[in-house]
């Protein structure tokens, strides 16, 4: 049974490809899903020689590997696109890379700008 999960209703939204996909670039996303299914937030990004390039942020449908994650932490060593998910409103505002091989933990803070 699920116990004490943080309910996710809103996530930080971002789309680097917003012009092509004809969406907003950034803001808040209200999560919608089927009854009895859990919802999560996610973040995805690239890391080019230490420069973080945000790809997308938003809501993520019920995914068991996201259950009970309070923080958005990616663990893959060196993927093309880093991915993390979490539960709780706006939990994808900050995201972290904590490689499984035990490298340094790197946390990315959002720039202090208002959503558009």
């Amino acid at each position: 049974s699920g116990r004490g999960e943080a309910e996710t209703r809103e996530c930080i939204y971002y789309n680097a490809n917003w012009e092509l996909e004809r969406t907003n670039q950034s803001g808040l996303e209200r999560c919608e899903g089927e009854q009895d299914k859990r919802l999560h937030c996610y973040a995805s990004w690239r890391n080019s020689s230490g420069t973080i390039e945000l790809v997308k942020k938003g809501c993520w449908l019920d995914d068991f590997n996201c259950y009970d994650r309070q923080e958005c932490v990616a663990t893959e060593e060196n993927p093309q696109v880093y991915f993390c998910c979490c539960e709780g409103n706006f939990c994808n505002e900050r995201f972290t890379h904590l490689p499984e091989a035990g490298g340094p933990e790197v946390t990315y803070e959002p720039p202090p700008t208002a959503p558009t």
């Epitope: 049974s1 699920g2 116990r3 068991f64 590997n65 259950y67 998910c85 904590l98």
Partner: antibody
């Protein structure tokens, strides 16, 4: 290299108990959801139970609810399945599996055989 | 009770193409069920082939592909080889922690 090593299987009488263990290595265990899947002799695969990264959420197939308990010790990198009130129909090879994003099983152990017979 | 259905058996000639399907009794399979496919040979642990409908797992040859066909998930094997003779299982994630396996398809490669 990811490794999942099940142990604890064996022969047990109906109504008896067993505890299966799955020792994990080669990945950050505390950051992975985990599952148990079983296969009765000559039959197909059947999902048995899953547990979230913290252990705070656990789920079971209907036929084992109230009899089986899944748990994990993240400090020991070990997954457990406590099986009580065992029945003949629980006879199977039990696999532990790592769950990845998109809710799929990306790595499997080699399995441990549980035989329930008098 | 959700029942996931697969063809019990299928045969294919070497070099041929075969499509195995995976449906369920309470609606259409969509990408939100994260369909995944596994190959198992007798006495061995399952091997992950396809996840998230159509993404090949690491090391899986591109002869294997996944898709949604109509209201079912599908696994297509093109250029079938003798060592593709195995049991194939689909899994649907129903949400709320519940995974459901199909009954499996026994694939025979003729000749």
């Amino acid at each position: 290299e990811v490794q999942l090593l099940e142990s604890g299987g064996g022969l047990v009488q109906p109504g008896g108990s067993l505890r299966l263990s799955c020792a994990a290595s080669g990945f950050t265990f505390r950051n992975s959801a985990m599952s148990w899947v079983r296969q009765a002799p000559g039959k197909g695969l059947e999902w048995v139970s899953s547990i979230s990264v913290t252990g705070g959420s656990t789920y079971y197939t209907d036929s084992v609810k109230g009899r089986f308990t899944v748990s994990r010790d993240n400090s020991r990198n070990t997954l457990y399945l406590q099986m009580n009130s065992l029945r003949a129909e629980d006879t199977a090879v039990y696999y532990c599996a790592k769950v990845y994003y998109y809710s799929f099983f990306d790595y499997w152990g080699q399995g441990t055989l549980v035989t329930v017979s008098s | 009770q959700t029942v996931v259905t697969q063809e019990p058996s299928f045969s294919v000639s070497p070099g041929g193409t075969v499509t195995l399907t995976c449906g369920f009794n309470s609606g259409s399979v969509s990408t939100s069920y994260y369909p995944s496919w596994y190959q198992q040979t007798p006495g061995q642990a399952p091997r992950t082939l396809i996840y998230n409908t159509n993404t090949r797992s690491s090391g899986v040859p591109d002869r294997f592909s996944g898709s949604i066909l109509g209201n079912k998930a599908a696994l297509t094997i093109t250029g079938a080889q003798a060592d593709d003779e195995s049991d194939y299982y689909c899994v649907l994630y129903m949400g709320s922690g519940i995974h459901v396996f199909g009954g499996g398809t026994k694939l025979t490669v003729l000749g």
